[in-house]
């Protein structure tokens, strides 16, 4: 393979890694017909002046978790075709200026994961062909004006993981291309009005993990291709009406963690193509009539983690594709009839952790393919008769952790819960509450014959009307899907985000008959 | 007190079809299933369908045959049996509940040409 | 379906002594946490009595000498001290799901 150093494997291809603990220099001769270098996990501590002169036709390079600290000006002389250069994960500090002279064809630049101070306007002048910049995990503290104003061609630039206080309104002016922008992980408190504006391209704005507290009205004005905004965990404590309004293209929007008090009716929108929106860990307290109603084509609305005690009756209109609704860690005492009536495609909704002391018997008429209902840990004494009587892909019920009353109203409940034993898994069996003599008990094999009558209503009337698939030979399967009510923080679509999801406590939305007990 | 009462014995040519109640009383009819279990001379038993607010489940095996119905107001619980044949000839309980709490006495079924 | 299978088909135990009656499913009839296996007494010409309901809690008016045990698949109907009364045939079955299935029964009789 025209000389390959001991140190190094070469393949066919032209591919040469050099790894290992024991190497603390390039090591050479290096095949002249490399065209991929990999130099990962090695001692090296400096590149020296021209280490990679005889492989010019080297298109990728990467020297990835050394002990780098200190490199030539001069290094990567005579690569003119290189089109990939990693230097993440090393310990640099300083770049000197010119080091990515004559790299014409560069356009991967990663130097994410080092200890970089500073970057200046003459770093990136020559490479004027470079779409990929990745300056993430340094210890930038600001970027000066022209940082970037040569890097017309860039697409994808992150800074997130620095410790960025400020950021120019100028910085970003001349990146038309620009598709995705991130800058989590910083200390930004706020973004000034025009930062954003030259980036009619942008398709993805990361800003979590900030301290930003306030939004400028007109910061995305400009932003029309925007798909996906991330503004959570930072310290927004209002939204300006208007600071959503020209996001056609949006269709993910994280907001949990931050401070929000209140929403105010089409604060977004329009979003026709928003499916999902993270507002849990906020201080939100009550929901108006249309807060959501530009968002026809919403599948995932999380609010848990709030302090909800008041849902207007029309709060959801406009929701007809949501899928997922999460309203769990609330302080909701009460719910009208109707709130749910326009969201016919609602398969999971989480109401868990509240202060519910019933149900209004339509609370679910509409949502006929709901498939997981949590209400565990709430007040709930009893539900109205059939209110689940047309749920028939209802495949989790969580009920414990409500004060359940075992008189002979309870029995209704009782019998719907043994009736549907078969296709609705539950992790958890509701307990009696009440009266003292059957307190702790399993609702579903309370002794009917020593609970309390009922002081309520002598005679218990019809519950289910009809039993679900009544008169068939067996229960449909069991459906399994995926949980997003016990989610922490959504996925995002990139690695580096470092934010996590927590699935449900047992994985499962509906088990099986050999998966429960 | 709660009370199953079922309707006498009968005999009944094969082929034929016969109908046989179970009233309730000393409970609220509507808010327990009614079972109904067989059991052949000498043998063990076999659970047939209950009936909960006119909505019914069926053992496989007296799909088709067996049918049960219920009236609210008398708080009875009827089933008939069709295509009557000597193996037929049992006794058939009706049962309360979940967990079978309380039977009827049973009615004797004689199926002889 | 769900087989149960009962063991002994037949016992016989001295008055005051134990008597155990075990039954076996053919799979788990436990659902919700709860194990739905009942026990059910029948003397001649008469219906069954229900005894133990959901593996270990008394039928109403049943004496507290009768007691059940076990979950899953494996279960136990102990009379503890055995009484004249007590001959009789002995029933298990499972509520899990349907066709409720029973086993094919225990003679139970004074030694």
């Known amino acids: 393979y025209h000389g390959c150093p001991s140190e190094c494997t070469c393949s066919r291809a032209s591919q040469v890694e050099c790894t290992g603990a024991r190497i603390v220099a390039v090591p050479t001769p290096l095949p002249w017909n490399a065209m991929s270098l990999q130099i990962l996990n090695t001692h090296i501590t400096e590149l020296n002046e021209s280490p990679f002169l005889n492989i010019s036709a080297l298109i990728a390079l990467r020297i990835e978790k050394n002990e780098l600290s200190r490199i030539t000006p001069g290094a990567f002389r005579n690569l003119g075709s290189l089109r990939y250069l990693s230097l993440a994960n090393n310990k640099l500090q300083v770049l000197p200026i010119g080091l990515f002279q004559g790299l014409d064809s560069l356009e991967s630049l990663l130097l994410s994961s080092n200890q970089l101070l500073q970057i200046q306007p003459a770093h990136f002048s020559q490479c004027s062909n470079l779409k990929e910049l990745q300056l993430h995990g340094n210890h930038l503290e600001y970027i000066p004006d022209g940082a970037f104003d040569h890097l017309v061609g860039l697409t994808k630039l992150n800074l997130g993981k620095n410790s960025l206080t400020h950021i120019s309104p100028r910085v970003f002016q001349h990146l038309g291309n620009l598709q995705v922008l991130r800058l989590y992980e910083n200390r930004l408190t706020d973004i000034p009005m025009g930062t954003f504006d030259g980036l009619v391209n942008l398709q993805e704005l990361a800003l979590q993990q900030n301290q930003i507290g306030l939004l400028s009205p007109g910061l995305f004005h400009n932003n029309h291709n925007l798909q996906r905004l991330y503004l959570s965990n930072n310290h927004i404590s209002q939204l300006p009406p208007s600071v959503f309004m020209q996001l056609p293209q949006l269709n993910r929007l994280t907001l949990f963690g931050n401070s929000l008090k209140e929403l105010s009716p089409g604060i977004f929108g329009p979003m026709p193509n928003l499916r999902e929106l993270w507002l849990y860990d906020n201080h939100i307290s009550s929901l108006p009539d249309n807060v959501f109603s530009n968002l026809r084509q919403l599948q995932v609305l999380i609010l848990s983690r709030n302090q909800i005690s008041f849902i207007s009756p029309g709060a959801f209109n406009g929701l007809t594709e949501l899928r997922e609704l999460s309203l769990h860690t609330n302080a909701l005492q009460d719910l009208d009839g109707n709130v749910f009536r326009m969201l016919a495609n609602l398969q999971n909704i989480s109401l868990q952790n509240n202060r519910l002391r019933q149900l209004p018997g339509n609370i679910f008429a509409n949502v006929n393919g709901l498939m997981a209902i949590q209400l565990q840990n709430n007040q709930l004494e009893n539900l109205p008769l059939g209110i689940f009587d047309h749920l028939g892909k209802l495949c989790e019920l969580r009920l414990y952790d409500n004060p359940w009353r075992c008189d002979s109203d309870i029995l209704p409940l009782r019998n719907w819960l043994l009736l549907n034993q078969p296709r609705l898994g539950t992790d958890t069996v509701p307990v009696c509450f009440s009266p003292a003599n059957v307190r702790g008990q399993s609702l579903i094999i309370i002794n009917v014959n020593v609970a309390v009558p009922s002081v309520h209503v002598p005679e218990v009337p019809s519950y289910p009307e009809t039993p679900w698939y009544p008169d068939t030979p067996s229960y449909p399967d069991t459906t399994s899907v995926s949980s997003t009510t016990e989610l922490t923080s959504p996925v995002e679509d990139y690695t580096d985000l470092t934010t996590i999801q927590v699935t449900d406590d047992r994985s499962v939305w509906g088990m099986t008959q050999a998966q429960s007990g | 007190e709660v009370q199953l009462q079922q309707s006498g014995p009968e005999l009944v040519k094969p082929g034929a079809s016969v109908k046989m109640s179970c009233k309730a009383s000393?409970?609220?009819?509507?808010?327990?299933?009614i079972h109904w279990v067989k059991q052949m001379p000498g043998q063990g038993l076999e659970w047939i369908a209950y009936?909960?607010?006119?909505?019914?489940k069926y053992n496989e095996k007296f799909r088709g045959r067996a049918t049960l119905t219920s009236d609210k107001s008398s708080s009875t619980a009827y089933m008939e049996l069709n295509s009557l044949t000597s193996e037929d000839s049992a006794v058939y309980y009706c049962?309360?509940?979940?967990?079978?709490?309380?039977w009827g006495q049973g009615t004797t079924l004689t199926v002889s040409s | 379906d769900i087989v149960l299978t009962q063991s002994p088909a037949s016992l016989a135990v001295s008055l005051g002594q134990r008597a155990t009656i075990s039954c076996r499913a053919s799979e788990s009839v436990d659902y919700y946490g709860i194990s739905f296996m009942n026990w059910f007494q029948q003397k001649p010409g008469q219906p069954p009595k229900l005894l133990i309901y959901?593996?270990?809690n008394q039928g109403s008016g049943v004496p507290a000498r009768f007691s059940g045990s076990g979950s899953g698949t494996d279960f136990s109907l102990n009379i503890h001290p055995m009484e004249e009364d007590d001959t009789a045939m002995y029933f298990c079955?499972?509520?899990?799901?349907?066709?409720?299935?029973f086993g094919g029964g225990t003679r139970l009789e004074i030694k």
């Open positions: 959901a593996a270990s």
């Open positions: 049962a309360r509940d979940f967990y079978f709490d309380y």
């Open positions: 009936i909960y607010n006119d909505g019914t």
């Open positions: 000393g409970y609220t009819f509507t808010s327990f299933v």
């Open positions: 079955q499972q509520s899990k799901e349907v066709p409720y299935t």
